[in-house]
């Protein structure tokens, strides 16, 4: 007789989740020599221990602490790139600008990127059928709590000038309810972070507006300034050109500047 299983509103755990996490861990240590001390089996055990046998609407940041400890990594000052609602471009950028890092360029972010997972209370099974949806079911689910935990840590350890890529095509360019707006902004440490520089990415080719004047950007500036961190903003009018110029900075068409309106 199949046992009763809670039906959640979100999609279930990603197929082959344990194998994917282990394989990604090995791949990451291959490419990042400074992380070769990492024991991928222990990483998986810590990951699993955070959500297996636990009610998936009652996950805490504490549950992820063993995993966070195993994945401890530091980013050099001035090299942290945060992003909100524009993940693909942020990742394309750090793939070219190899000395800058998004959360997904770090071990823990790399392991979990684009994956879903959850377990069930009192069983050792992974739930491949459904997992809690943040809006429809609960916010304290394994995936949401994971990203909140690692995003908090990523922001806390940032230093120097921190950059953030924002999507200028959204109605709220800065969204207080995003991970960036609700977690990362509030966990930048003023004693370590001198400034936050926002890059507002324009969507339309003919869009010449200064989106650094957007009310939500002004709201971000206010929050950051109150935390004694300086704020700068740049418009990236042509993201395709921006990436091209990161790849080939000597290109003559790049010398004229691809972003304008530098705000203090």
């Amino acid at each position: 007789v199949p046992r009763w299983r809670q039906q959640w509103s979100g999609s279930g755990t990603t197929s082959r989740f344990p194998e994917t996490v282990l394989a990604r861990c090995v791949k990451y240590t291959e490419v990042h020599p400074e992380m070769r001390h990492v024991d991928c089996q222990s990483v998986w055990d810590a990951f699993k221990g955070a959500f297996i046998s636990k009610y998936p609407c009652n996950i805490t940041e504490e549950d992820y602490q063993p995993l966070v400890k195993l994945g401890t990594q530091t980013v050099p000052c001035n090299k942290t790139l945060l992003w909100s609602r524009i993940k693909d471009l942020a990742h394309q950028f750090t793939q070219v600008q190899r000395d800058m890092f998004t959360l997904e360029d770090m071990l823990l972010g790399y392991l979990a990127d684009d994956l879903t997972w959850c377990g069930e209370f009192n069983t050792f099974e992974i739930n491949y059928q459904s997992c809690p949806d943040w809006r429809k079911d609960c916010s304290n689910n394994p995936v949401s709590v994971f990203w909140k935990t690692v995003s908090r840590r990523f922001a806390e350890t940032a230093c120097g000038v921190v950059h953030v890529m924002l999507n200028g095509s959204r109605s709220k360019i800065f969204d207080k309810n995003s991970t960036f707006g609700s977690v990362e902004v509030h966990n930048l440490q003023p004693e370590k972070v001198q400034a936050l520089e926002a890059w507002v990415i324009h969507g339309g080719r003919e869009d010449s507006r200064d989106l650094c004047q957007d009310p939500t950007i002004k709201e971000l500036e206010s929050i950051i300034s109150k935390r004694n961190i300086r704020f700068f903003c740049k418009n990236i009018y042509r993201p395709d050109k921006f990436l091209q110029c990161v790849k080939n900075p000597e290109d003559s068409s790049c010398l004229s500047g691809i972003h304008h309106h530098h705000h203090h």
């Epitope: 090995v26 020599p33 001390h37 089996q41 055990d45």
Partner: antibody, heavy 121, light 107 residues
Framework: QVTLKESGPTLVKPTQTLTLTCTFS??????????VGWIRQPPGKALEWLAH???????RYNPALKSRLTITKDTSKNQVVLTMTNMDPVDTATYYC?????????????WGQGTLVTVSS | DIQMTQSPSSLSASVGDRVTITCQAS??????VAWYQQKPGKAPKLLIY???YRYTGVPSRFSGSGSGTDFTFTISSLQPEDIATYYC?????????FGQGTKLEIK
């Protein structure tokens, strides 16, 4: 089947430099994810990790001995060489080489038989 | 450096006995602990890694458990061929460190 074998002098004088070679088969250091390390064991005592080298020439040393150690590899000969300078009688030990594999971090799963090195004048 | 304190340093047991060896790390190593068996005049052999995973071909009577700082190695039913010295090792961080060993003898 993976096999490793250590070779080198059985006797060295104090202040001299020790050179040990680990020759292996069934293992290639041109293969991503593989590495070889050195561990020693003084007579009747515990094991002490010395150094490791990975397929891509990434090296790790025991900080307490780092200034005296050099690890290198010759991929074409399937060999890893450890040199240890300024030998002292306290360095008398059986020296082992062993394989490591990415993902299990620094767990040694295959070991050589060991070679006893005595430091004496 | 992380110190690995093994106990007991020696123990005597009878064939068929359940044998337990403990290892304490001086700081949290999560589950990054391995156990090796070394017979006189031979190289160590890997038995357990990542605290509880039996290495390929290792008999099921050998097991490991623990996390954080406290780890246990167990032989569920001692066999004559198990007479050896057993070492724990943390593989959490460099420098890799070993316990001082537990010498196991038959009564």
């Amino acid at each position: 089947q993976v096999t490793l074998k250590e070779s080198g002098p059985t006797l060295v004088k104090p202040t001299q430099t020790l050179t040990l070679t680990c020759t292996f088969s069934g293992l290639s250091l041109s293969t991503s994810g593989k590495g070889v390390g050195w561990i020693r064991q003084p007579p009747g005592k515990a094991l002490e990790w010395l150094a490791h080298i990975w397929w891509d020439d990434d090296k790790r040393y025991n900080p307490a001995l780092k200034s005296r150690l050099t690890i290198t590899k010759d991929t074409s000969k399937n060999q890893v060489v450890l040199t240890m300078t300024n030998m002292d009688p306290v360095d008398t030990a059986t020296y082992y080489c062993a394989r490591i594999e990415l993902g299990r971090s620094y767990v040694m799963d295959y070991w050589g038989q060991g070679t006893l090195v005595t430091v004496s004048s | 450096d992380i110190q690995m304190t093994q106990s007991p340093s020696s123990l005597s047991a009878s064939v068929g006995d359940r044998v337990t060896i403990t290892c304490q790390a001086s700081q949290d190593v999560i589950t990054s602990v391995a156990w090796y068996q070394q017979k006189p005049g031979k190289a160590p052999k890997l038995l357990i890694y990542s605290a509880s995973y039996r290495y390929t071909g290792v008999p099921s009577r050998f097991s490991g458990s623990g996390s954080g700082t406290d780890f246990t190695f167990t032989i569920s039913s001692l066999q004559p061929e198990d007479i050896a010295t057993y070492y724990c090792q943390q593989h959490y961080t460099i420098p890799l460190t070993f316990g001082q060993g537990t010498k196991l003898e038959i009564k």
